[in-house]
């Protein structure tokens, strides 16, 4: 028994007919199964393969080879959540956070809890003391005094 | 078994807005697109639109462009189809529908009345 | 969008008789083509697609034919059940046009 166009198997009850549009992006096999032309996927072809190590957490794709983030994610594979703006010195786990570096604090991370170390602000010889976020206190050898030893 | 059971019969006045649900089971929800189609008393079937339930991209009938939305919820398996400035020949029975090739499976049905 | 002629919008026929629907669109659809049987208070039921492939369950007295732009149903031997309206449907592109319906009642 021949077949006509497009339909295939025992009794001719299956139908193929390659299709490349919103329903599908598939060719048909000998057999009259759908096979998928490259960079789609699913039982209807109709799903995209996405840029190879794109997230499959927080990157989709309506394209093959592509990437695009949810909301709060970045990056060329969607792998990098965005911490929360005006972070200075700070990271991010998961979307909007600011998780301070060493010697940072403050909801933006942008008060320096280390000044004497960044800024070795006491002149002469002057030992500092840090005395709160973006605050330090200089202590003057004999002969010296003003708020950096610098008299 | 795959069944689609969808919300109750809605009445409503000319102007409103109607929102019907459609349940999915027995099978993967966004392997399948979902069809809206409806039927005035008395009338044939009309073919609304359909929705890819895995992007959640809808393609609507000229008919009801600007006024029909279909969205999905793939958290709970159901998709919904709202049709706003509903007038008096809005009313009919709109139903669900599964597939590619034709519609095996539907939904039970929704009427919609619209009266003043 | 593609039209959807469906004749005869009505028909009268004993049992036993055979009966036959066409569907006749107004560009070529191949065989992206679906048959549906609905009774009163009923969702329809699928019964052909593709033109030509029975669907699940249904009996074989249903038969579809026909590719590009006419397409027919045909019972062989219609039952008392088989009374009910019947829609052809493309599933071409989008819109998925359904025909006008044929209304087959008991002579």
């Known amino acids: 028994v021949t077949c006509d166009d497009y339909y295939y198997g025992f009794g001719c009850n299956k139908f193929c007919r390659p299709r490349d549009d919103f329903f599908g992006h598939y060719a048909c096999d000998q057999n009259g199964n759908k096979t998928c032309m490259e960079g789609w996927m699913g039982p209807e072809c109709n799903r995209a393969i996405c840029r190879q190590g794109c997230s499959p957490k927080h990157g989709s794709c309506k394209l093959p080879g592509d990437c695009r983030c949810q909301y709060g994610w970045q990056g060329l594979y969607c792998d990098k959540c965005i911490p929360h703006p005006g972070c200075v010195h700070g990271i991010c786990n998961e979307p909007w956070q600011c998780l301070c570096e060493t010697n940072w604090g403050g909801q933006l991370c942008d008060k320096d809890l280390n000044y004497c170390g960044t800024h070795q602000p006491c002149l002469n010889g002057g030992t500092c003391s840090n005395t709160g976020p973006d605050k330090y206190q200089c202590s003057c050898p004999e002969g010296y005094s003003g708020p950096n030893c610098e008299i | 078994q795959v069944q689609l059971v969808q919300s109750g019969a809605e009445v409503k006045k000319p102007g409103a807005s109607v929102k019907v649900s459609c349940k999915a089971s027995?099978?993967?929800?966004?392997?399948?697109?979902i069809h809206w189609v409806r039927q005035a008393p008395g009338q044939g079937l009309e073919w609304m639109g359909i929705?890819?339930?895995?992007?959640?991209?809808?393609k609507y009938a000229q008919k009801f462009q600007g006024r029909v939305t279909m969205t999905v919820d793939t958290s709970t398996s159901t998709a919904y189809m709202e049709l706003s400035s509903l007038r008096s020949e809005d009313t009919a029975v709109y139903y669900c529908?599964?597939?590619?090739?034709?519609?095996?499976?539907w939904g039970q049905g929704t009427l919609v009345t619209v009266s003043s | 969008d593609i039209q959807m002629t469906q004749s005869p919008s009505s028909l009268s026929a004993s049992v036993g008789d055979r009966v036959t629907i066409t569907c006749r669109t107004s560009?070529?659809?191949?065989?992206?083509l679906t048959w549906y049987q609905q009774k009163p208070g009923k969702a329809p039921k699928l019964l052909v697609y593709n033109a030509k492939i029975l669907a699940a369950g249904v009996p074989s007295r249903f038969s579809g034919s026909g590719s590009g732009t006419d397409f027919t149903l045909t019972i062989s031997s219609l039952q008392p059940e088989d009374f009910a309206t019947y829609y052809c449907q493309h599933h071409y592109d989008i819109p998925w046009t359904f025909g006008g319906g044929t209304k087959l009642e008991i002579k």
């Open positions: 027995g099978y993967t929800f966004t392997d399948y697109a």
């Open positions: 560009e070529n659809i191949y065989s992206y």
């Open positions: 929705i890819n339930t895995y992007y959640g991209d809808s």
């Open positions: 529908a599964r597939g590619y090739d034709g519609f095996a499976y």
